[in-house]
C-alpha cells in the first residue's frame, strides 16, 4: 500500500555567504493532512526552522503556495546565509491531531555547507627593527572561511618561501575557521624594497587568491657606514673635513662632529640622496681653522642612527706651518676607526 | 486566449534524442508548474514530468526517469522535453499541459496542448 | 502507484439519456480526483476537479461525487457533442495516475 513518504532529493547544498540556500522536500502524498515542519537538526535539542502552521519566520520563504490544499512541494528559502547556518536540515511531515498535530515522517535531511570567504590576510612583521642578516619573524592572519581546505603561502620579492609554520583552527568542526602562519625571513642589505606577501587560496575565491603585504622598509634597519676625508686646502688657515654617511635606512639619522673630544657641530640628516636599493646618502662637513690649534687634531665624525648606540670615525689632522693636502682614510691618519664613542 | 502549442516530434530511431518544445501564450507562464503527459496510440494517458513554476523542482515517471529531462525557460514562455535513449515503447502524442494552481506542485491539469507525435521506429 | 480502474470500458446511451462512469481507487485518495474528456483526435479537457469541483465553463450536466476509494461521474442528459472518452485521474499520490478511460457511444 502507497504511504506518504517525504522526499528530500538533495543530500547537500553547499551556498556561499550571503546567498540564499533552497533546501527542497517534496511529499508524494496529499495525504494524511497536516502541515509541514523545518528543523535544523535531530533529536530533542532539534533548532525549528519553519512551521507551516504558525511563527515568524523572517529569513524563510517557502518555494510554493503552502496555503493551498493540493500542494506536495514544500521546500523552503533560507536568506542572507552565514556560517552559523550550516547543519542538517529534515522536512517533517505532520499529521493532523486533537489536541497537537503528531509527527508522522521525516525526510532524510540536506546537509547545508556555508562557503565563507577568508577576510583579507592582515601580514605583520616584527616590533622592533632589524639588521641585515639577522632572521625576522612575520605573522599571517585570516579569519571567517568555510570549508576548512585552505592554502597559504608565503613569497619575498616574488620569490616563495619554505621557512613557515602555519596552523588552521578549530582543528574539529566548526562552522568558520582561522588561519595563521609565521614565516621566517633573512634580511639582506638590499631589502628596503623588499615585500613579504602573504597568499591565501580557498575554494570561495575561484582561483584568484587574496594577498596581505609587509613592506621591509618598516622592519630593516640598515646601518651606515662612515668615511671621513681631508680635502685640498681652502685657504692658508683652513681645513675641510667630510663625513660621508652611506648606505643607511631608515633616514632618521644626527651627526656630531667632535674636536678633540669636545662637540663642535651636531646636525639632523635632512636633504640626503637616495640609492637605488633605498638606502640613504648623506655628507656633512667641517671646517676646520687650523691656525687656532698648536697642537695635531683630532676630529671625529660621530653618527647615531635611528635611536642606536652611536658610531664613529676618527681623523687625524696634523698642524703644521704649512698644511699638506692629506690622503684620505690612510691608517696613521684614522684612529679610532669605528670605535664606540662614550661621551 | 490561453494556449500551449507543442513542437519537435517526428519520426526517430531507438536509442537517439528527441527535444520537444511548448510555448505558452495567454497566461502568466512563469506562476505555474508544467507538466508532459503522454498517450500511446490506442492508449489511456501517462504522466510523464513536471516541473515547478520557477524551475527549482522536477518530477518523473519511473519508465523515464535519467532518460528524460524537463526544463523551462520562463523568459521564453517555453516548456522543453528533452528526450534521450529512445525505446519503441516511448511512441506516443506528447503533450504539454499546466497545472491547475499557481505557485504548487500540484497534479491536476486545466490547460492542455494539442499534442505533438513521437514515433520510435527503425 | 496507485491503481485507478474505470468502469465500464466503454458504454452505448441514448441522447438525453443518464450516464454513469465508476472509478475505483487501489487506496484511499481523499477527494483528490479529477475527471478529462478526450474527444477523438483532441487533447483531454478538465471537466470536474476535487472529485466534485465543477470546471468554469463546463456545462451543468456534468458532475461528480464520492471520496476514498469510490468515485462517480455523471451526465445528466447525453448530447451529441458529448462523444468522448472520459478519464478519472488521482493526484493524491506521485505518481499522479489515469483511469483506463470510459469510451461513450450515442446508440
Known amino acids: 500500500e502507497e504511504e506518504l513518504q517525504v522526499i528530500q532529493p538533495d543530500k547537500s547544498v553547499l551556498v556561499a555567504a550571503g546567498e540564499t540556500a533552497t533546501l527542497r522536500c517534496t511529499a508524494t502524498s496529499l495525504i494524511p493532512v497536516g502541515p509541514i515542519q523545518w528543523f535544523r537538526g535531530a533529536g530533542p535539542g532539534r533548532e525549528l526552522i519553519y512551521n507551516q502552521k504558525e511563527g515568524h519566520f523572517p529569513r524563510v520563504t517557502t518555494v510554493s503556495d503552502l496555503t493551498k490544499r493540493n500542494n506536495m512541494d514544500f521546500s523552503i528559502r533560507i536568506g542572507n546565509i552565514t556560517p552559523a547556518d550550516a547543519g542538517t536540515y529534515y522536512c517533517v511531515k505532520f499529521r493532523k491531531g486533537s489536541p497537537d498535530d503528531v509527527e508522522f515522517k521525516s525526510g532524510a535531511g540536506t546537509e547545508l555547507s556555508v562557503r565563507a570567504k577568508p577576510s583579507a590576510p592582515v601580514v605583520s612583521g616584527p616590533a622592533a627593527r632589524a639588521t641585515p642578516q639577522h632572521t625576522v619573524s612575520f605573522t599571517c592572519e585570516s579569519h571567517g572561511f568555510s570549508p576548512r581546505d585552505i592554502t597559504l603561502k608565503w613569497f619575498k620579492n616574488g620569490n616563495e618561501l619554505s621557512d613557515f609554520q602555519t596552523n588552521v583552527d578549530p582543528v574539529g568542526e566548526s562552522v568558520s575557521y582561522s588561519i595563521h602562519s609565521t614565516a621566517k625571513v633573512v634580511l639582506t642589505r638590499e631589502d628596503v624594497h623588499s615585500q613579504v606577501i602573504c597568499e591565501v587560496a580557498h575554494v570561495t575565491l575561484q582561483g584568484d587568491p587574496l594577498r596581505g603585504t609587509a613592506n621591509l622598509s618598516e622592519t630593516i634597519r640598515v646601518p651606515p657606514t662612515l668615511e671621513v676625508t681631508q680635502q685640498p686646502v681652502r685657504a692658508e688657515n683652513q681645513v675641510n673635513v667630510t663625513c660621508q654617511v652611506r648606505k643607511f635606512y631608515p633616514q632618521r639619522l644626527q651627526l656630531t662632529w667632535l674636536e678633540n673630544g669636545n662637540v663642535s657641530r651636531t646636525e639632523t640628516a635632512s636633504t640626503v640622496t637616495e640609492n637605488k636599493d633605498g638606502t640613504y646618502n648623506w655628507m656633512s662637513w667641517l671646517l676646520v681653522n687650523v691656525s687656532a690649534h698648536r697642537d695635531d687634531v683630532k676630529l671625529t665624525c660621530q653618527v647615531e642612527h635611528d635611536g642606536q648606540p652611536a658610531v664613529s670615525k676618527s681623523h687625524d689632522l696634523k698642524v703644521s706651518a704649512h698644511p699638506k693636502e692629506q690622503g684620505s682614510n690612510t691608517a696613521a691618519e684614522n684612529t679610532g676607526s669605528n670605535e664606540r664613542n662614550i661621551y | 486566449q490561453v494556449q500551449l502549442v507543442e513542437s519537435g516530434g517526428g519520426v526517430v530511431q531507438p536509442g537517439r534524442s528527441l527535444r520537444l518544445s511548448c510555448a505558452a501564450s495567454?497566461?502568466?507562464?512563469?506562476?505555474?508548474?508544467m507538466a508532459w503527459v503522454r498517450q500511446a496510440p490506442g492508449k489511456g494517458l501517462e504522466w510523464v514530468a513536471q516541473?515547478?513554476?520557477?524551475?527549482?523542482?522536477?518530477y518523473y515517471a519511473d519508465s523515464v526517469k535519467g532518460r528524460f529531462t524537463i526544463s523551462r525557460d520562463n523568459s521564453k514562455n517555453t516548456l522543453y522535453l528533452q528526450m534521450n535513449s529512445l525505446r519503441a515503447e516511448d511512441t506516443a502524442v506528447y503533450y504539454c499541459?499546466?497545472?491547475?494552481?499557481?505557485?504548487?506542485?500540484?497534479?491536476?491539469?486545466?490547460?492542455w496542448g494539442q499534442g505533438t507525435m513521437v514515433t520510435v521506429s527503425s | 502507484d496507485i491503481q485507478m480502474t474505470q468502469s465500464p470500458s466503454s458504454l452505448s446511451a441514448s441522447v438525453g439519456d443518464r450516464v454513469t462512469i465508476t472509478c475505483q481507487a487501489s487506496?484511499?485518495?481523499?477527494?483528490?480526483l479529477n475527471w478529462y474528456q478526450q474527444k477523438p483526435g483532441k487533447a483531454p479537457k478538465l471537466l470536474i476537479y476535487?472529485?466534485?469541483n465543477l470546471e468554469t465553463g463546463v456545462p451543468s450536466r456534468f458532475s461528480g461525487s464520492g471520496s476514498g476509494t469510490d468515485f462517480t461521474f455523471t451526465i445528466s442528459s447525453l448530447q451529441p457533442e458529448d462523444i468522448a472518452t472520459y478519464y478519472c485521474?488521482?493526484?493524491?499520490?506521485?505518481?499522479?495516475?489515469f483511469g483506463g478511460g470510459t469510451k461513450v457511444e450515442i446508440k
Open positions: 499541459a499546466r497545472d491547475l494552481t499557481k505557485y504548487t506542485l500540484g497534479f491536476a491539469f486545466d490547460i
Open positions: 495567454g497566461f502568466t507562464f512563469s506562476s505555474y508548474g
Open positions: 516541473i515547478l513554476y520557477d524551475g527549482s523542482n522536477e
Open positions: 487506496q484511499d485518495i481523499s477527494n483528490y
Open positions: 476535487d472529485a466534485s
Open positions: 485521474q488521482q493526484f493524491t499520490y506521485l505518481p499522479p495516475t
